[in-house]
């Protein structure tokens, strides 16, 4: 039995930050779980891990080069990625694993979310006439 995951098809990070919500067909309440976010078509880079435990607060770990936070809902985990770079534009996949109680459960691979990171652009100066030259 596999958990189903829903993600937005695409998100744009205009301010170099984005909230990616992973919605599951499973209630995480009173479960010990490991939610993770993976970058790339092959999911090769584990970007962020959220450890959930019914007896304590969430533990959030980010891979080097990523700044991540996590928020838990009954059937969702939202990853908040900050300080993203343009070259981190990629497809990101949510993964969920219910570690306890048995049996171990994980998800069917989702369709992923393309996160498009827009570069920080300096705003041009407003157009107004400068001091006139003789």
């Amino acid at each position: 039995n596999k958990i189903l995951v829903k993600q937005s098809p695409m998100l744009v990070a205009y301010d170099n930050a984005v909230n990616l919500s992973c919605k599951y067909s499973y209630n995480l309440f009173s479960r010990e779980f490991r939610a993770s976010l993976h970058k790339g078509l092959d999911s090769a880079v584990e970007v962020c891990v959220v450890y959930g435990n019914y007896s304590q607060q969430l533990q959030v770990y980010s891979k080097t080069g990523f700044n991540c936070d996590g928020k838990l809902g009954n059937e969702s985990v939202t990853f908040y990625l900050q300080n993203l770079y343009v070259n981190q534009t990629d497809i990101y996949f949510c993964k969920i694993e219910v570690m306890y109680p048995p049996p171990y459960l994980d998800n069917e691979k989702s369709n992923g979310t393309i996160i498009h990171v827009k570069g920080k652009h300096l705003c041009p100066s407003p157009l107004f006439p400068g001091p006139s030259k003789p």
């Epitope: 490991r34 891990v49 980010s62 080097t64 936070d69 694993e97 570690m99 306890y100 048995p102």
Partner: antibody
Framework: EVQLVESGGGLVKPGGSLRLSCAAS????????MNWVRQAPGKGLEWVSS????????YYADSVKGRFTISRDNAKNSLYLQMNSLRADDTAVYYC????????????WGQGTLVTVSS | EIVLTQSPATLSLSPGERATLSCRAS??????LAWYQQKPGQAPRLLIY???NRATGIPARFSGSGSGTDFTLTISSLEPEDFAVYYC?????????FGQGTKVEIK
């Protein structure tokens, strides 16, 4: 070359305090989660604490929670562990360890500093 | 907290022989298991992560396998520098935990 050098260990009486330091070099310290792992004499390894790049996520093993405080100074490329209310079972070699390329693996490690808690 | 049990406690072998070290988790940790090597008076060194992936610079004679609760570290042909203590570590659950170690000694 990546280097982690711990200092500050020594002999302290039960109930006493000690502050360990770890000087990092050879990598961009401010971009790595850092950890303390300890090893009691002749025993195995025990993860103690970790701190994220901007100090926004700090975690402790239950055995040290409320007594130890981890901190970092990215400008000085340094990691710290303030240890209060020390007990005999805190006696160990304390290693500073950088997070590896994989979340919650430890690579590399410093050479360690010995903390002895005894009256 | 996940308990990792390593066996045997000590393995006595000769250079050139094959070493097989075991690590068993009290609950399934999926493939989130690492192996470290520690020589006397030195810090541990990461060998294998996520059950079967060799860390950078680790010789091919070191290999890892397993998933769930049972994991194995194999050293195909022992070199003199491989005699050391080996620890497994899991990152599937919180908090990360280590096994008690297996000492590989010269017979």
């Amino acid at each position: 070359e990546v280097q982690l050098v711990e200092s500050g260990g020594g002999l302290v009486k039960p109930g006493g305090s000690l502050r360990l330091s770890c000087a990092a070099s050879g990598f961009t310290f401010s971009t790595y989660t850092m950890n303390w792992v300890r090893q009691a004499p002749g025993k195995g390894l025990e993860w103690v604490s970790s701190i994220s790049t901007s100090s926004s996520h700090i975690y402790y093993a239950d055995s040290v929670k409320g007594r130890f405080t981890i901190s970092r100074d990215n400008a000085k490329n340094s990691l710290y562990l303030q240890m209060n209310s020390l007990r005999a079972d805190d006696t160990a070699v304390y290693y500073c360890a950088r997070e590896g390329n994989i979340v919650l693996t430890f690579d590399p490690w410093g050479q360690g500093t010995l903390v002895t808690v005894s009256s | 907290e996940i308990v990792l049990t390593q066996s045997p406690a000590t393995l006595s072998l000769s250079p050139g022989e094959r070493a097989t070290l075991s690590c068993r988790a009290s609950q399934s940790v999926s493939s989130y298991l690492a192996w470290y090597q520690q020589k006397p008076g030195q810090a541990p060194r990461l060998l294998i992560y996520d059950a079967s992936n060799r860390a950078t610079g680790i010789p091919a004679r070191f290999s890892g396998s397993g998933s769930g609760t049972d994991f194995t570290l194999t050293i195909s042909s022992l070199e003199p520098e491989d005699f050391a203590v080996y620890y497994c570590q899991q990152r599937g659950y919180w908090p990360p935990t280590f096994g008690q170690g297996t000492k590989v000694e010269i017979k």
